[in-house]
Interface confidence: low
């Protein structure tokens, strides 16, 4: 018999099915059975861990510890689940050069035969952008495309109005600078930039997910928060009300609490089993 | 607003166990972030000693893993350093602190800090 | 370990310059760092992290820069509060190793 849930590894989770709890010759689901953002489901006699984030196609790229590239941090999430090792964010952008697998100490990169990973030129591409090493110099393209954006005026921490959040990431991009979305609507000096200009600005913002979002926290005069409010919401969205000092979190369904830290058992998933009910 | 507070004894004797609390208000320990303990010996720099994460997984400075436990009280959200053998050298203001989750590990918010003077 | 230095362990400048500290770390730590200032018989605070990015709430005349193995912080505009020590942070492995300290005194 396997010695833990991580030796039923699937390629979509894991399938426990068979596996011998010797006091309730049931193996139950409990808060850790499944770490790393996994979803514990038990069907009859099959404990089974799945992955399914939700993730969307935007192209923010990140490189993990493990010296793999993501396309952007949901799918690295998504691999540390289904792998159930810790997978940290060690930049913005994509890994520069492979580096060696395995465990050791290193917090930002793969840490096997190479003691560390050599730094490229490509290093110096941030905000989005990707970099062309077959340029005799070095070159930073973004191959951002705004055109299909919807309008949701926002006020950038440039002190300048763009037509939505694409076009600061854009514009971030092209002038290799952290520009952060810091309000709804247009400045106040009503300053806008609403094309690609060379002046323009785009920051790898994560709030530029999707417009529908970004619409529906301007209804309720939210703003998503900083960058440096990562994690503070477990399992929901990080929004920061001009009223409030403190950030707010909007939780995803079947969470609750401050930092939708807690399952909200409100919320009834029915497992098809022998079991008659189970909270997934 | 998040604080942490540190509280311990101010004195122990060389080879006995330093034992310090860190109480955290304004946000849960279990729901993110990691919780380091840092120390300062008079008039140096900063040393970090280890971290104790959301989800109760620790790591170690190396200097001290032999001597070094990190622990934690979800009920009371407070996390604990233990230091045992402790010598002359290891005293210093020791200071509890939050650091960020998902790659980046600065520390955004600090105790007041606590001095420990280790003598006989 | 990673060692962080700090080449001048003090400096001497005054209300309203442009100073710069600077950082080295003994390996490419990426971009895996972070700046504090200690002001005297009270705990660290963050200024910068990931190298250039600024803590909510600090003041606009810190700025942050450099990547691999070379980092600099910059007040472009010295005021009184800003007399204190300043250490840099790398968390690119571990254990986490912070530098010397660098003073900031009134000239």
């Known amino acids: 018999f396997p010695t833990s849930l991580s030796d039923c590894q699937t390629p979509t989770g894991w399938n426990c099915s068979g596996y011998d709890d010797r006091e309730n010759d049931l193996f139950l689901c409990d808060t850790n059975t499944c770490k790393f953002d996994g979803e514990c489901l038990r069907i009859g006699d099959t404990v089974t861990c799945v992955c399914q984030f939700k993730c969307n196609n935007d192209y923010v790229p990140v490189c993990g510890s493990n010296g793999e590239s993501y396309q952007n941090e949901c799918y690295l999430r998504q691999a540390a689940c289904k792998q159930q090792s810790e997978i940290l964010v060690v930049s913005e952008g994509s890994c520069a050069t492979d580096a060696g697998s395995g465990s050791g100490d290193g917090v930002h990169e793969g840490s096997g035969e190479t003691s560390q990973k050599e730094t490229s030129t490509c290093d110096i591409c941030q905000f989005g952008a990707e970099c062309d090493e077959d340029a005799e110099d070095v070159w930073c393209v973004c191959n951002i495309d705004c055109s299909q954006t919807n309008f949701n005026p926002l006020c950038a921490s440039d002190g300048k109005s763009y037509d939505n959040a694409c076009q600061i990431k854009e514009a971030s991009c092209q002038k290799q600078e952290k520009i952060e979305v810091m309000s709804l609507g247009r400045c106040q000096d009503n300053t806008t930039t609403t094309t690609k200009s060379e002046d323009g600005h785009y920051a790898r913002t994560d709030y530029a997910e999707n417009a529908n979002k970004l619409e529906e926290s301007a209804r309720e005069h939210h703003i998503p928060c900083p960058e440096h409010y990562n994690g503070f919401c477990m399992h929901g969205k990080c929004e920061h009300s001009i009223n409030m000092q403190e950030p707010s979190c909007r939780c995803d369904a079947g969470y609750t609490g401050q930092h939708c830290e807690k399952k909200d058992y409100s919320v009834l998933y029915v497992v098809p089993g022998p079991v008659r009910f189970q909270y997934v | 607003d998040v604080q942490l507070q540190e509280s311990g004894p101010g004195l122990v004797k060389p080879s006995e166990t330093l034992s310090l609390t860190c109480a955290v208000t304004?946000?849960?320990?279990?729901?993110?972030?990691?919780w380091s303990w840092i120390r300062q010996p008079p008039g140096k720099g900063l040393e970090w000693m280890g971290f104790i994460s959301y989800d109760g997984s620790n790591k170690y400075n190396p200097s001290l893993k032999n001597r070094i436990s990190i622990t934690r009280d979800t009920s009371e959200n407070q996390f604990f350093l233990k230091l045992s053998s402790v010598t002359a050298a290891d005293t210093a203001v020791y200071y509890c602190?939050?650091?960020?989750?998902?790659?980046?590990?600065?520390?955004?918010?600090w105790g007041q800090g606590t001095l420990v003077t280790v003598s006989s | 370990d990673i060692q962080m230095t700090q080449s001048q362990s003090s400096m001497s400048t005054s209300v309203g310059d442009r100073v710069t500290i600077t950082c080295k770390a003994s390996?490419?730590?990426?971009?895996?760092v972070a700046w504090y200032r200690q002001k005297p018989g009270k705990s660290p605070k963050l200024l910068i992290y990931?190298?250039?990015n600024r803590h909510t709430g600090v003041p606009s005349r810190f700025s942050g820069s450099g990547s691999g193995t070379d980092f600099t912080l910059t007040i472009s505009s010295m005021q009184p509060e800003d007399f204190a020590d300043y250490f840099c942070q790398q968390y690119s492995s571990y254990p986490f190793t912070f530098g010397g300290g660098t003073k900031l005194e009134i000239k």
């Open positions: 390996q490419n730590v990426v971009t895996a």
């Open positions: 602190a939050r650091g960020l989750r998902r790659g980046d590990y600065s520390m955004d918010y």
């Open positions: 990931s190298a250039s």
């Open positions: 304004g946000y849960s320990i279990t729901s993110g972030y990691y």
